[in-house]
């Protein structure tokens, strides 16, 4: 069973009194409706809460919203609805919070029918004051901030116009009509697709991809016959319709669309889709859907150019376009990803990779757990993680897996132990080494969050009954203590803590229900007195990530280097603090063939690490040969894995081959792209 409250657990002394002095209740004196919460800035303590209430009347909908502001991490709230003239705010647009610590907020208001345009309320001072601005259009999407300059906003209108503001929403200019999708790129560049013949849906596959680098003064058409496009890391992707049939292919650019290369990926038909699962500046994980309504596809990982792809994982669960996939980046350890596969018998199993998709394996069975009824062999089974798919299937899973970059190695997730994911009520499991080993942490489903960079884990039981107890652990989930935060239980609706897991505050949201009234309520608990002192050097210990065998000279080497971290000792009850920076020391590893992927036209035979030339090019390899760019067809068979930093050791140099000779048709040069000014 999971470790719990027993005499073996290290206790935090006098914690009830310490927490009681730091528990703050706020009752929201309005009718219970939906509550949305946003943090404004980092380490500012500013929270905005929007409560909305709808009454559908026969002719129209009556709506009321209230806006509250806290500047002490949710301990106290002030009703600031008057700052937005008591206007009803549209929750579907949420609160558009500016990037970094800009202090900018945009709220989109509901306006009465027949008005010329929409209305927004803008703040540049962390929601202390708001300015009302009437828009010359009705917004279709939330305002999008440029990542580089928070004064630059873009929005799409209900008429499919692309609107830009250069002064934080004060003045707006329509820079293009007939726009389907628009995104900010780097350096204040905007990418967008346009239609010619009536609508986005009608023109799907015949859209044009445009770019403006000067906020709409001039434009360049960078793609035609576009189905869709996406940005990931330094890569710009477009799925482009083929000339001869209804299939489409991925093209990739690393220079903002000036030049394109065809990706060596299978083409897809009308009912299939591509999806960028994850991307960074080194590489991309791409899902390619299988033909037919299978609910699965294949994950491919790219080279550093985003052009050559290696098959990473078969039968990857991904239901439909925009549907559910369990693909999760474990942000607490480099190179680790978790996802689900649909096995031949239609059961769902969890897989994990520790080397950025190079190899996938099942999750190790937790030492303190038994195999469940799904296991054929009661001694041999794996942990299976519940993520987005389970949540979408309405299983008793209140939260997706959780990891934080500054809580090194920690992963928390719901799961079951057997041969596949079970529909039975799950338990909560924790890993402290990035997914290599797991322990049952809590019995039954819970909400959970990480505070103080892993110094505290907080959990609340998922229950249909009202609750008044919170659990917390100061030793990475080994031992738990319970605190009754209110005498009168509340119907729980959510757990909120400041993004980034540096905070010591947790807010428990819910509502109270009596005979006639229902009120929203929050309890904010500050754990600062539980962790009384600041952590010192002696509170940390050294940990080697990805260590599996100390007798192996290259133990811990992943993508060509190993990393040692200073980690908080489980027995240390102290504050990492808001300014905590993960201390790590990398050391470069010697290269082996594992540090290289096979270039186009080469493959690895099973159980062999050498890349061997393909005897003949078939399928999408042949298409790449025909339509790929000339310089990509010259290779020595190996390419270093993106992000791999190894040095010395094996250097697989062999003669450079020109694969053009294998292509059975002349090379087709890509079409020239046209430019035009506004």
């Amino acid at each position: 069973s999971a470790p719990g409250e027993d005499e073996e657990c290290g206790r935090v002394r006098d914690f009830v009194a310490k927490l009681a002095n730091n528990t703050h209740q706020h009752v929201f004196d309005d009718l219970r409706g939906s509550v949305s919460l946003s943090w404004v800035g980092d380490s500012t303590g500013v929270i905005l809460v929007l409560t909305t209430f709808h009454v559908p009347l026969v002719i129209m909908t009556f709506g009321q919203s209230k806006l509250y502001r806290s500047e002490d991490y949710g301990k106290n709230f002030k009703d600031i609805t008057d700052l937005i003239n008591n206007t009803f705010i549209r929750t579907e647009f949420g609160m558009a919070i500016g990037p970094e610590n800009s202090g900018k907020v945009v709220l989109t208001a509901e306006v009465s029918g027949g008005s010329r345009g929409g209305r927004i309320f803008r703040s540049s001072d962390f929601a202390k004051n708001f300015v009302q601005t009437d828009l010359p259009f009705h917004p279709l999407t939330q305002m999008m901030y440029s990542p580089q300059n928070s004064d630059y906003l873009l929005a799409l209108s209900t008429e499919n116009g692309l609107w830009v503001s250069k002064n934080f929403g004060g003045k707006w200019e329509e820079i293009h009509k007939a726009v389907c999708l628009a995104k900010w790129g780097s350096d204040n560049t905007i990418f967008f697709t346009t239609y010619a013949n009536g609508s986005c849906k009608a023109d799907l596959g015949a859209l044009e991809l445009w770019r403006t680098s000067d906020l709409g003064k001039s434009f360049k058409t960078i793609g035609v016959k576009i189905y869709s496009f996406g940005l990931g890391g330094r890569f710009l992707f477009a799925s482009v319709m083929a000339d001869k049939d209804t299939t489409r292919r991925i093209h990739v650019s690393t220079d903002q669309g000036d030049t394109w290369s065809m990706a060596q990926l299978p083409s897809v038909g009308q009912e299939q889709f591509y999806s960028i699962l994850a991307a960074n500046d080194d590489m991309v994980f791409m899902h390619v859907d299988e033909p037919g309504d299978t609910g699965f596809g294949t994950i491919f990982t790219s080279d550093d150019r985003g052009i050559v792809y290696s098959k990473s994982l078969d039968r990857h669960l991904y239901t439909t376009t925009g549907g559910e996939t369990d693909f999760t980046n474990v942000t607490s350890l480099r190179g680790v990803y978790i996802t689900s596969v649909l096995s031949e018998d239609n059961s769902i199993q969890t897989m994990i990779t520790f080397d950025q998709g190079g190899r996938w394996t099942h999750l190790r069975k937790p030492e303190n757990s038994e195999c469940d009824a799904t296991a054929k062999n009661k001694n041999e089974c794996s942990l299976h993680i519940h993520a987005s798919y389970s949540i979408s299937q309405k299983l008793n899973v209140p939260m997706a897996p959780l990891s934080e970059p500054n809580a090194v190695g920690i992963v928390i997730a719901h799961g079951s132990v057997g041969d596949a994911i079970s529909v039975m009520v799950p338990d909560v499991y924790i890993s402290d080494d990035g997914g290599y080993s797991w322990t049952k942490m809590l019995e039954g489903p819970h909400y959970y969050t990480i505070l103080d960079s892993g110094g505290i884990i907080v959990a609340i039981e998922h229950s249909s009954r009202p609750i008044n107890v919170i659990k917390f652990s100061t030793d990475e989930g080994q031992c738990w203590q319970t605190y009754t935060f209110t005498r009168d239980p509340i119907y729980f609706t959510g757990l909120a803590s400041e993004p980034g897991a540096r905070s010591m505050n947790i807010s428990i949201w819910g509502f109270t229900e009596s005979f006639l009234t229902s009120q929203a309520v929050s309890y904010t608990i500050d754990f600062k007195d539980i962790l009384e002192r600041n952590c010192e050097e002696k509170d940390y210990t050294i940990w080697l990530a990805h260590s599996t065998d100390p007798e192996d000279y290259e133990d811990g080497c992943i993508l060509g280097y190993k990393e040692q971290f200073l980690r908080l000792r489980k027995s240390s009850v102290c504050q990492n603090g808001r300014d905590y920076v993960v201390t790590k020391q990398p050391s470069i590893c010697l290269c082996s063939l594992e540090d290289f992927l096979c270039d186009f036209g080469y493959y690895r035979p099973e159980n062999d690490s050498k890349c061997v030339e393909q005897p003949e090019l078939k399928g999408h390899d042949l298409e790449f040969c025909l339509y790929g760019r000339e310089e990509h067809l010259t290779t020595n068979g190996y390419r270093k894995i993106p992000g791999d930093k190894c040095q010395g050791g094996v250097n697989p140099v062999r003669e450079v081959k020109d694969l053009k000779k294998k292509c059975t048709s002349n090379f087709l040069s890509p079409e020239k792209q046209n430019s035009k000014s506004n």
């Epitope: 050294i542 100390p550 007798e551 000279y553 040692q564 027995s571």
Partner: antibody, heavy 124, light 106 residues
Framework: QVQLVQSGAEVKKPGSSVKVSCKAS????????ISWVRQAPGQGLEWMGG????????NYAQKFQGRVTITADESTSTAYMELSSLRSEDTAVYYC?????????????????WGQGTTVTVSS | DIQMTQSPSTLSASVGDRVTITCRAS??????LAWYQQKPGKAPKLLIY???SLESGVPSRFSGSGSGTEFTLTISSLQPDDFATYYC????????FGGGTKVEIK
């Protein structure tokens, strides 16, 4: 089989320094922490500090902070412990020991391989 | 630093006896405890790590238990070779040893 071989006995004057070496053979020296433990005549064991050869991360017991320096040379698979400002109470057998390791944590699994010990006598 | 208190400091026993030595930590150390055996003029030898895991090559009559602050080393049937001094050692703070327990012939 891993072995740790320490340098020979030393006789030192109060106020001077001593440097004891510990050479590893037959294993991956770089992947394990090396601890230094001393034992005064008729007394118990006392941990002085340790080092991880990769990166050279050293940490010391509070009692010896500022007086002990632990280093490692990966190329020769040798760890060193230097103790300065010697006094008569430092007369002891000094052991180096390899910290066993089953996971990424360097110091959590006990000391599974020990050197033969080096006797240091501090006398005027 | 975490203090380790070992008891008893001396223990008289006969061959075949079941022997128990306890070790108490001044604060919780989870399971991060090791036990050593030391004979005069020799280096210590690791018997148990992580409170209850037996080091390879160590006879199964040695066992460890406990977690948090209370730990026990048990020798199920004392053998002539087992007369020695035993030390516990915590590894979750800066390493500290217990004062030792001398097991002598009754």
């Amino acid at each position: 089989q891993v072995q740790l071989v320490q340098s020979g006995a030393e006789v030192k004057k109060p106020g001077s320094s001593v440097k004891v070496s510990c050479k590893a053979s037959g294993g991956t020296f770089r992947n394990y922490a090396i601890s230094w433990v001393r034992q005064a005549p008729g007394q118990g064991l006392e941990w002085m500090g340790g080092i991880i050869p990769i990166g050279g991360w050293a940490n010391y017991a509070q009692k010896f902070q500022g007086r002990v320096t632990i280093t490692a040379d990966e190329s020769t698979s040798t760890a060193y412990m230097e103790l300065s400002s010697l006094r008569s109470e430092d007369t002891a057998v000094y052991y180096c020991a390899r910290q066993g390791r089953k996971t990424g944590y360097y110091y959590y699994y006990g000391m599974d391989v020990w050197g033969q010990g080096t006797t240091v006598t501090v006398s005027s | 630093d975490i203090q380790m208190t070992q008891s008893p400091s001396t223990l008289s026993a006969s061959v075949g006896d079941r022997v128990t030595i306890t070790c108490r930590a001044s604060q919780s150390i989870s399971s991060w405890l090791a036990w050593y055996q030391q004979k005069p003029g020799k280096a210590p030898k690791l018997l148990i790590y992580k409170a209850s895991s037996l080091e390879s090559g160590v006879p199964s009559r040695f066992s460890g238990s406990g977690s948090g602050t209370e730990f026990t080393l048990t020798i199920s049937s004392l053998q002539p070779d087992d007369f020695a001094t035993y030390y516990c050692q915590q590894a979750d703070g800066h390493i500290t040893f217990g004062g030792g327990t001398k097991v002598e012939i009754k």
